[in-house]
């Protein structure tokens, strides 16, 4: 679009997964278009075909290899190319030297449970997914609760500044449902942003026993 | 914040050749691509050429195609664009322009940009 606006953003998901959106201003729906990678010190090259996900704007993800094989690096740089196809020919959109390091988005944390519960407390743990060693400790985590009567995102954020895979939430009340969720960012990485919020882990407190507050 | 300005513009013979050069300042210029545009008098801004700072991927306008050359260099942090075979209506108001990260046709795209500088083709 000439004079209109598009938009061109991938994330790499630090092992095996690039994700790219590619949005336009007046683009048709049924234009077909594909995110072509091709890295600059790897003998690999990649293709994944852009699928509608609203009205102007298409996603698809670059499978680099087996989900926890590390494909890249920090000094790798893959130049990305959005290609539509118009009429009998395929022609360039969008062009971006991707820094795969600098563009992290993990997956979302996964293997949510509840380790121990109690009338005012919950402590929870879970697992990350696919995210690179290269991190080693370097991971921080954002984790929030929905109370009976509110929604998400009324819900206050609690902040892990370092990589710890559990919380303990207090202040809770007895015998109440409530639901959490946690997600993850790495500390590198100028474009870097934080994973998708993980399913909900639903939870009850215990009852306060009879004839005590 | 990025700082572009533009130079080389000038008066030139239908057929002849000019260059135009760009230099861009800023923090992290690499993650900030150039494109050159245009505009006639009386006419819209036009897409002209782009390329990125490190793999050097160019695009470029129909219009111009086998005529006009866009590169850059990383150490001067500037990027060109050789004009030849040039005809009178490539005259105009060229402008470089970045966009951060990616390069597209569209002017909307680019977040900064020069003041610009006049080519005039005579016939």
């Known amino acids: 679009a000439v004079n209109g606006t598009s938009r061109f953003t991938c994330f790499y998901n630090s092992r095996a997964n690039i994700s790219c959106v590619w949005s336009q201003d007046g683009a048709l729906q049924d234009t077909s278009c594909q995110v072509h990678a091709w890295p600059d010190r790897r003998r690999w090259n990649q293709t994944c075909e852009l699928l509608p996900v609203s009205q102007a704007s298409w996603a698809c993800n670059l499978i680099l290899g087996t989900p926890d094989s590390q494909k890249l690096t920090a000094v790798d740089i893959v130049t990305l190319r959005v290609m539509c196809r118009e009429g009998v020919r395929w022609r360039m959109m969008a062009i971006q030297d991707f820094k795969p390091f600098e563009n992290l988005r993990l997956m979302a944390p996964i293997s949510l449970q509840v380790v121990h519960v109690e009338t005012h407390r919950c402590n929870i743990s879970w697992k990350i997914s696919q995210a690179s060693h290269y991190f080693e400790r370097h991971l921080e985590f954002e984790a929030r609760t929905l109370s009976p009567g509110h929604t998400w995102e009324e819900a206050p954020l609690m902040t892990l500044k370092q990589k710890q895979e559990w919380i303990c939430l207090e202040t809770l009340t007895p015998d109440t449902q409530y639901e959490f969720q946690v997600r993850v960012k790495p500390l590198q990485g100028e474009f870097t942003t934080w994973s998708p919020w993980s399913q909900p882990l639903a939870f009850r407190t215990k009852p306060a026993a009879l004839g005590k507050d | 914040e990025v700082q572009l300005v533009e130079s080389g513009g000038g008066l030139v013979q239908a057929g002849g050749s000019l260059r135009l050069s760009c230099a861009a300042s800023?923090?992290?210029?690499?993650?900030?691509?150039v494109g050159w545009f245009r505009q006639a008098p009386g006419k819209e801004r036009e897409f002209v050429a782009a390329?990125?700072?490190?793999?050097?991927?160019?695009l470029y306008a129909d219009s111009v195609k086998g005529r006009f050359t866009i590169s850059r260099d990383n150490a001067k942090n500037t990027v060109y664009l050789q004009m030849s075979s040039l005809k009178p209506e490539d005259t105009a108001l060229y402008y470089c322009?970045?966009?951060?990260?990616?390069?597209?046709?569209?002017?909307?795209?680019?977040?900064?940009w020069g003041q610009g500088t006049q080519v005039t083709v005579s016939s």
């Open positions: 322009a970045a966009a951060l990260k990616t390069i597209t046709r569209g002017q909307n795209d680019y977040s900064y």
């Open positions: 800023g923090r992290a210029i690499e993650n900030y691509p």
């Open positions: 390329i990125t700072w490190i793999s050097g991927s160019t």
